[in-house]
């Protein structure tokens, strides 16, 4: 397969959020574990009520019997509400038609209201970017949906964290769900409109502000918590916009709405590429150079407190999580695969199906180490040692665990920690961790990672096969664990 074809294929795989996941299969391994405890109680049919995480610490006597009764009650009530559940989010194009996609068509959002809830989840879609006329023209030809609203469907199905099914979304299933399609190609940072001089509009930052403004009239004004989430470029968009949203709500007279961020697969490193290439297209261009050019092209805006720290022309620094995160006021939960495919792509690492040479293997391992280091001072983080990209709107986002804790559970613990933050206690909640970063050093050393498929045969590979394919010498891998290679292979093959 030619390089260009492979890149296009990779891009299209990265773009089809919630669809077929390309090289990864999200499935449960063996027997399904019991779902994590729900953080919201199911509302009685026809009578939605706001609900809060249940705290059973006060329950005396037989906890098992109490929980059995709750489960039985929930099961008997669930069919009543399930019949009425419509998973679809409905498209609303912005009333203010001057806030547009790249091609001048109005931007918009998909909304599914949950009248009983005062929680609002606003999700920013991802999908790379373009940073000059040439690669934006090419993007318009091949990925128009990411530059125009003209062909958007009337509805979208909420998946993963946007799902209203408690089984699929034990974290926030009852929230008001908003999906904001990415059609500005500017990592949600732009503030420039289409004109005679500018062939394209880049209004990502303005789209978010306008969506928030319009949602205030649709019930957001009564919100208790607004969670701005996003994946990939949308994850970086969260870091760039979360404080501005909080500021906007404060200025509009809604200071009581707590704004938080959830950045998935948007925490990139401005590291040295594996092989340096000239900046000719989105994929080969080193991220620092792409963003440097992009900011000028988009009239990109970055958080003020970050901008202050860098010289004129150096604002690109603020697109990198580890530099912008410390300047943010709003709490942000960072989700990042330690071996992110998009990071590897911009670093010119292309896993072609051939066994990996030692130099590349060490580069990949070092990437995981560097990423882990940048997360050490991020109290709320979830970073599994997997080779993947994006997670939160995948249907099986509940499957991956770090140190025995799933992402929905970690997010629930984060909610609790923020709820309790006005109390003096600085210690993390017992048995409810929020800083979850894998410490094992190679890709897929975490057995709950999504299964890898061989890029060419389509066959599933178990972890042992994958590691050998990656050129890891089993002796080297087994030794630090105090194991024989055969024992390690057995353990990895069993997924333990």
């Amino acid at each position: 397969m030619g390089r260009g074809v492979r890149v296009l294929l990779l891009l299209s795989l990265l773009h089809c959020a919630g669809g077929s996941e390309g090289r990864k299969t999200w499935r449960r391994r063996g027997q399904q574990p019991p779902p994590p405890p729900r953080t919201e109680a199911a509302p009685a049919a026809g009578q939605p009520v706001e609900s809060f995480p249940l705290d059973f610490t006060a329950v005396e006597g037989n906890m098992d019997s109490f929980m059995a009764q709750v489960k039985s009650l929930a099961q008997s009530l669930y069919p009543c509400s399930a019949q009425q559940l419509n998973e679809d989010l409905r498209l609303h194009l912005l009333l203010n038609t001057s806030v547009t996609c790249n091609d001048g068509s109005p931007a918009g959002y998909y909304l599914k209201e949950s009248r009983g809830s005062r929680r609002w989840l606003l999700f920013l879609e991802g999908g790379w970017y373009c940073f000059n006329r040439e690669n934006c023209d090419s993007r318009y030809d091949t990925m128009r949906r990411l530059m125009s609203s003209r062909d958007w469907p009337r509805t979208r199905t909420g998946t993963g964290i946007l799902s209203s099914q408690p089984e699929e979304n034990p974290y926030w299933w009852n929230a008001n769900m908003v999906f904001i399609p990415y059609c500005s190609s500017d990592v949600w940072s732009g503030a420039s409109s289409k004109s005679e001089k500018n062939e394209y509009a880049f209004m990502g930052a303005l789209i978010i502000q306008e969506v928030v403004r319009e949602l205030l009239g649709r019930g957001l004004s009564g919100a208790k918590v607004l969670l701005l989430a996003g994946s990939s470029a949308g994850g970086t968009g969260v870091l760039l916009n979360v404080d501005r949203v909080a500021e906007q709500l404060e200025k509009l007279g809604y200071p009581a709405i707590q704004v938080r961020g959830l950045a998935d697969s948007g925490w990139f490193l401005d590291n040295k590429q594996y092989r340096h290439t000239d900046c000719v297209d989105t994929i080969t261009c080193a991220p620092t150079e792409a963003i440097r050019r992009g900011i000028r092209y988009w009239n990109g805006v970055v958080p003020e407190r970050c901008r202050r720290q860098f010289q004129e022309g150096e604002e690109w620094n603020c697109f990198f999580g580890y530099k912008v995160y410390p300047t943010l006021r709003c709490p942000v939960f960072v989700v990042q695969w330690l071996f992110d495919e998009a990071q590897l792509t911009v670093d010119n690492v292309h896993l072609t199906g051939q066994p990996v040479q030692e130099g590349l293997r060490l580069y990949i391992q070092n990437l995981g180490r560097e990423l882990r280091h940048t997360l050490k001072d991020v109290p709320a983080s979830f970073a599994p040692a997997c080779l993947s990209h994006e997670i939160i709107i995948r249907s099986h986002w509940t499957d991956v665990q770090v140190k025995g804790t799933s992402l929905p559970r970690a997010l629930h613990c984060w909610d609790r920690s923020l709820h309790d933050s006005h109390k003096a206690s600085k210690t993390p909640l017992k048995g409810c961790p929020v800083h979850l970063v894998d410490s094992c050093p190679w890709p897929h050393c975490n057995p709950s990672c999504p299964t890898v498929r061989d890029q060419f045969t389509g066959q599933e590979m178990n972890v042992a096969q994958f590691l050998m394919h990656m050129g890891f010498d089993m002796q080297t891998v087994a030794q630090p664990q105090g194991l024989e290679p055969s024992e390690l292979l057995g353990m990895l093959s069993n997924g333990s």
């Epitope: 707590q258 720290q309 860098f310 010289q311 004129e312 300047t327 933050s421």
Partner: antibody
Framework: QVQLKESGPGLVAPSQSLSITCTVS????????VQWIRQPPGKGLEWLGV???????KYNSTLMSRLSISKDNSKSQVFLKMNSLQTDDTAMYYC???????????????WGQGTLVTVSA | DIVMSQSPSSLAVSVGEKVTMRCKSS????????????LAWYQQKPGQSPKLLIY???TRESGVPDRFTGSGSGTDFTLIISSVKAEDLAVYYC?????????FGGGTKLEIR
């Protein structure tokens, strides 16, 4: 350890200008900003301005027209210049380190010992 | 600009007594999204630079004795010295770091009887 030390002229005649240097050690001006604060004798503290790590500057709006802050990263020095001094500019002038990227505006954990500037004929 | 007011402007106490001083801001220093109050307290002993005691309204700077306690939220804040020692003779300032320019209160002068 983190240290800041101000050095200034001591005495300045009215309408003249003032130059103070803040020399830092234990950290780099590439990573941290430096803030200037003054305190008239027996009075409270007044923030004057900041030069951030990246070289951008912000001044107290009431003194903006008279103030100028600059730095030399390689020499670990920050400079405060103030012109058209009057007797009510008599004060102890302090430089203080900010918190880098972490919080801005900051609280001030590291201060210089201050340099007393007296404006008098 | 945010205006910071402190009271009392001075007070005299005996060693071992409990001292309470107050600081009021002209607008809320509580940032709702992270539940933090953007307020710090400093101690300035005669002839010395100010020394940081408390930030986030209630977090003690390392090395600061636990007899110093900060509390309050929004616009009203308090610094308490549970049992005054002779070495606590100083002027105490509060400072907001919610927005530029950072501003300080006029100070509370603590004298030992």
């Amino acid at each position: 350890q983190v240290q800041l030390k101000e050095s200034g002229p001591g005495l300045v005649a009215p309408s003249q200008s003032l130059s103070i240097t803040c020399t830092v050690s234990g950290f780099s001006l590439i990573n941290f900003g430096v803030q200037w604060i003054r305190q008239p004798p027996g009075k409270g503290l007044e923030w004057l301005g900041v030069i951030w790590a990246g070289g951008r500057i912000k001044y107290n709006s009431t003194l903006m027209s008279r103030l100028s802050i600059s730095k030399d990263n390689s020499k670990s020095q920050v400079f405060l210049k103030m012109n058209s001094l009057q007797t009510d500019d008599t004060a102890m002038y302090y430089c203080a380190r900010d918190l880098g990227l972490n919080w801005d505006p900051p609280w001030f954990a590291y201060w210089g010992q201050g340099t007393l500037v007296t404006v008098s004929a | 600009d945010i205006v910071m007011s402190q009271s009392p402007s001075s007070l005299a106490v005996s060693v071992g007594e409990k001292v309470t001083m107050r600081c009021k801001s002209s607008q809320s220093l509580l940032y709702n999204s992270n539940q933090k109050n953007y307020l710090a307290w400093y101690q300035q002993k005669p002839g010395q630079s100010p020394k940081l005691l408390i930030y986030w309204a209630s977090t003690r700077e390392s090395g600061v004795p636990d007899r110093f306690t900060g509390s309050g939220s929004g616009t009203d804040f308090t610094l308490i010295i549970s049992s005054v020692k002779a070495e606590d003779l100083a002027v105490y300032y509060c400072q907001q770091y919610d927005s530029y320019p950072p501003t300080f209160g006029g100070g509370t002068k603590l004298e030992i009887r």
